[in-house]
């Protein structure tokens, strides 16, 4: 999990790292929830979007993200966000051609259809939390997560160590 | 614009067969599942078929499963139904709908129909 | 099958409140659409997930699903909303319609 002394150490080092070619190392389907089980949800046009944090009916599939997984250059200092000692970073897509994105100057989050190679607003650090759940830090804005506000998703600026375990910037990902 | 423009429809004997189009323009239509809808002269809406965006995926009404088929051609905006061995039953005016919201990765038939085509009336009759 | 039920008529007076239902075996564990067809014309989507308004239809239309049960509410009606509405879910990737209601306004 993300190192409770590190935040300051961390930041840091997010600005000066760098995505390791342009493949993802793995891909992986999976639904998106919150720390309290609300369902992230997707409802998205051509010309417009949605994105709910709800509480599913019973007999409704649950949204599902294709999480692209890249190793970042730069070594991590903290234990268990990395492989062999290196950042994980994540993009998050619910339909072909669509990312999530990280709008800093409105602190929110946003679904932009692009092309590949993804800007750097597309891409968040992931980091694996207790009780098997995960938050994801702005690569553009270190110290910011994604995280649940008035039932929307929003960027989440975590200011203190103490702060990276609140349950608004936790998300469990489950493949059912 | 969304507009789904549907033709193909006519006058066709029982045990014949009918292909109907559906033109789409004003949206990505490969990132849409697209549904064949009909309503019988005096009766209700009933879904007849659905197809996935890439054309992966299809599903049927009990109704019409192994004598329509559902297709789609990306390249060319158009979804089809190949209609065979039409009963006097089959006769309605035929909507093409698109979904309301673009495709999840889970897939199969989720969303509400949001547009609708004008219609292509279908007469089975000897 | 699955099998949606909605009375075959329902009359209203101009400014008064109609209220359509749609029945089905756990109803409130799906979300309902519902659409309004007026004759000669396409169907047009009014409510979807139980509650929602799309964008250009009136706040007099309104939903509610719970139980085995969903309802259309429509509040000071029009003689422009008289026309044929239909319930609608998703079940085991098929659609199904309910058989409409006709609805007159006085």
């Known amino acids: 999990a993300f190192g409770i002394s590190g935040v300051q150490k961390y930041t840091r080092a997010l600005h000066d790292s760098s995505i390791t070619g342009i493949s993802p190392i793995t891909e992986y389907l999976a639904s998106l929830s919150t720390y309290n089980d609300q369902s992230i949800t997707f409802a998205l046009e051509d010309e417009s979007y949605e994105i709910y944090v709800e509480d599913l009916k019973k007999d409704e599939k649950k949204d599902k993200v294709l999480l692209s997984y890249y190793e970042s250059q730069h070594p991590s200092n903290e234990s268990g966000d990395g492989v062999d000692g290196k950042m994980l970073m994540v993009t998050l897509s619910p339909t072909k051609d669509f990312w999530l994105h990280a709008n800093n100057k409105e602190h929110s989050v946003e679904l932009h259809k692009c092309e590949k190679p993804l800007p750097d607003q597309a891409f968040f650090v992931l980091h694996n939390m207790h009780s098997n759940c995960v938050s994801f830090e702005c690569k553009t804005d270190p110290g910011v997560f994604i995280g649940v506000k008035d039932n929307h998703l929003a960027l989440i600026k975590v200011d203190s160590s103490e702060n990276l375990c609140t349950e608004n910037i936790l998300f469990k990902l489950s493949e059912t | 614009e969304v507009q789904l423009l549907e033709s193909g429809g006519g006058l066709v004997q029982p045990g014949g067969s009918l292909r109907l189009s559906c033109a789409a323009s004003?949206?990505?239509?490969?990132?849409?599942?697209m549904s064949w809808v009909r309503r019988a002269p005096g009766k209700g809406l009933e879904w007849v078929s659905a197809?996935?965006?890439?054309?992966?995926?299809?599903y049927y009404a009990d109704s019409v499963k192994g004598r329509f088929t559902i297709s789609r051609d990306n390249s060319k905006n158009t979804l089809y139904l190949q209609m065979n061995s039409l009963r006097a039953e089959d006769t309605a005016v035929y909507y093409c709908?698109?979904?309301?919201?673009?495709?999840?990765?889970?897939?199969?038939?989720?969303?509400?129909?949001?547009?609708w085509g004008q219609g292509t009336m279908v007469t089975v009759s000897s | 099958s699955y099998v949606l039920t909605q009375p075959p008529s329902v009359s209203v007076s101009p400014g008064q409140t109609a209220s359509i239902t749609c029945s089905g075996e756990?109803?409130?564990?799906?979300?309902a659409a519902w659409y309004q067809q007026k004759p000669g014309q396409s169907p047009v989507l009014v409510i979807y997930?139980?509650?929602k308004r799309p964008s250009g239809i009136p706040e007099r239309f309104s939903g509610s699903n719970s139980g085995n049960t969903a309802t259309l509410t429509i509040s000071g009606t029009q003689a422009i909303d008289e026309a044929d509405y239909y319930c609608?879910?998703?079940?085991?990737?098929?659609?199904?319609f309910g058989g409409g209601t006709k609805v007159t306004v006085l």
């Open positions: 197809i996935s965006g890439s054309g992966g995926s299809t």
């Open positions: 004003g949206f990505t239509f490969s990132s849409y599942a």
């Open positions: 609608e879910v998703k079940k085991s990737d098929t659609g199904v």
């Open positions: 709908a698109r979904d309301l919201w673009m495709e999840n990765w889970v897939g199969g038939l989720r969303y509400p129909f949001g547009y």
């Open positions: 997930q139980d509650t």
């Open positions: 756990r109803m409130g564990d799906k979300y």
